[in-house]
């Protein structure tokens, strides 16, 4: 028969016929034979592979340096690698965590519109109309201004983005 | 596409507690502000309470003591503490997706009902 | 604190008429207002916010306007499929409040 051109899904051609791949988490020792199957050995500890393959060595887990600000999220198997991510208060730099900043804290006059991950930063939002932040916060959200209606009072100084309004008693007029 | 479901709504007895869970998809609650609304049969919205992205929570000045609401990474909870037939209701949970601090629900669940008798 | 008062509580309208329905806030909300619709047995859905800003997918026919405290929602050429109750909601304060939302009007198309 016509060797083949192509193989099944989960093969590899070589020497013109059609091998198994190593399913993951093993590697290729030798190629199949006319006679022989292919043959494949797990990874050793701390090593992996997550596809069907033909690789002749397994990879590495990374390694969750902790003098970057890394700790390890998911302990890596046979079949998947290490995931790391950042200790509390730090974020990664990139989407495969290779090391890590500390979260940004929102300025005064901005509050936090949504809070760092171990993945993303701080997302800040100035503080609108009407609301207030007179902090540096990594967790606070804008405050809105007091309502000095509400207890009675008048305003005596207008409040800012960074200030909350100044509430008073209101003048009696005198009979 | 973002969607927010209700569950754990049953008739249950005066007093037994009961906690309602919302399961929330394609998206993040640290980004989400996420609120428990409530409608009685024939009545109009009923605002019960926020857990913002942040963690911090406030209630209706009304709902203080009666409710409590807590989140997990994908899930946010509301229990009623000591029910009565007054809390009878159709419990919306709805999702601010601007994370700021101005709240508009653009996100609602089809709702859970509770039923309170005895 | 910030007690939201709907009116009327129920209005008809003729098809191709126009509604107009008021929100009033017992104190300044700026113009951090929202407008929602619901048709029985469903949750509402988000039609204004921002006082006059449309909601994604909604129909030109709706319009939101006011700030402080006196807002108005305007329907206009009224379809049976406006049918429904109509509710404002403040989204400045959830600290010190009662219910963000306001009582609620229904609209009857005939």
């Known amino acids: 028969p016509e060797p083949p051109t192509a193989c099944r899904e989960k093969q590899y051609l070589i020497n013109s016929q059609c091998c198994s791949l190593c399913q993951p988490g093993q590697k290729l020792v030798s190629d199949c034979t006319e006679f022989t199957e292919t043959e494949c050995l797990p990874c050793g500890e701390s090593e992996f592979l997550d596809t069907w393959n033909r690789e002749t060595h397994c990879h590495q887990h990374k390694y969750c340096d902790p003098n970057l600000g890394l700790r390890v999220q998911q302990k890596g198997t046979s079949e998947t690698d290490t995931i790391c991510t950042c200790e509390e208060g730090w974020h990664c730099t990139s989407e495969a965590c290779e090391s890590c900043v500390l979260h940004r804290s929102c300025s005064p006059g901005f509050g936090v519109k949504q809070i760092a991950t171990g993945v993303s930063d701080t997302i800040c939002e100035p503080c609108p109309v009407g609301f207030f932040s007179n902090v540096s916060s990594a967790f606070e959200k804008c405050h809105p201004w007091t309502s000095c209606e509400t207890k009675d009072l008048v305003v005596q100084q207008a409040g800012t983005n960074k200030t909350d309004v100044v509430c008073g008693p209101q003048d009696r007029l005198r009979a | 596409c973002q969607s927010v479901e209700e569950s754990g709504g049953r008739l249950v007895t005066p007093g037994t507690p009961l906690t309602l869970n919302c399961t929330v998809s394609?998206?993040?609650?640290?980004?989400?502000?996420m609120n428990w609304v409530r409608q009685a049969p024939g009545k109009g919205l009923e605002w019960i309470g926020v857990?913002?992205?942040?963690?911090e929570i406030f209630y209706a000045s009304w709902a203080k003591g009666r409710f409590t609401i807590s989140k997990t990474s994908t899930t946010v909870d509301l229990k009623i503490t000591s029910p009565s037939t007054e809390d009878t209701a159709t419990y919306f949970c709805?999702?601010?997706?601007?994370?700021?601090?101005?709240?508009?629900?653009?996100?609602w669940g089809p709702g859970t009902l509770v039923t309170v008798s005895s | 604190a910030y007690d939201m008062t709907q009116t009327p509580a129920s209005v008809e309208v003729a098809v191709g008429g126009t509604v107009t329905i008021k929100c009033q806030a017992s104190q300044t909300i700026y113009t951090y207002l929202a407008w929602y619709l619901q048709k029985p047995g469903q949750p509402p859905k988000l039609l204004i916010y921002?006082?006059?800003k449309l909601a994604s997918g909604v129909s030109s026919r709706f319009e939101g306007s006011g700030s402080g405290t006196q807002f108005t929602l305007t329907i206009s050429g009224v379809q049976c499929d406006d049918a429904a109750t109509y509710y404002c909601q403040q989204g400045y304060n959830s600290r010190h409040v009662d219910n963000v939302f306001g009582g609620g009007t229904e609209v009857v198309v005939k």
């Open positions: 857990i913002w992205n942040n963690g």
């Open positions: 394609g998206f993040s609650l640290s980004s989400y502000d």
């Open positions: 709805a999702g601010d997706a601007d994370g700021g601090v101005v709240s508009y629900f653009h996100v």
């Open positions: 921002e006082a006059s």
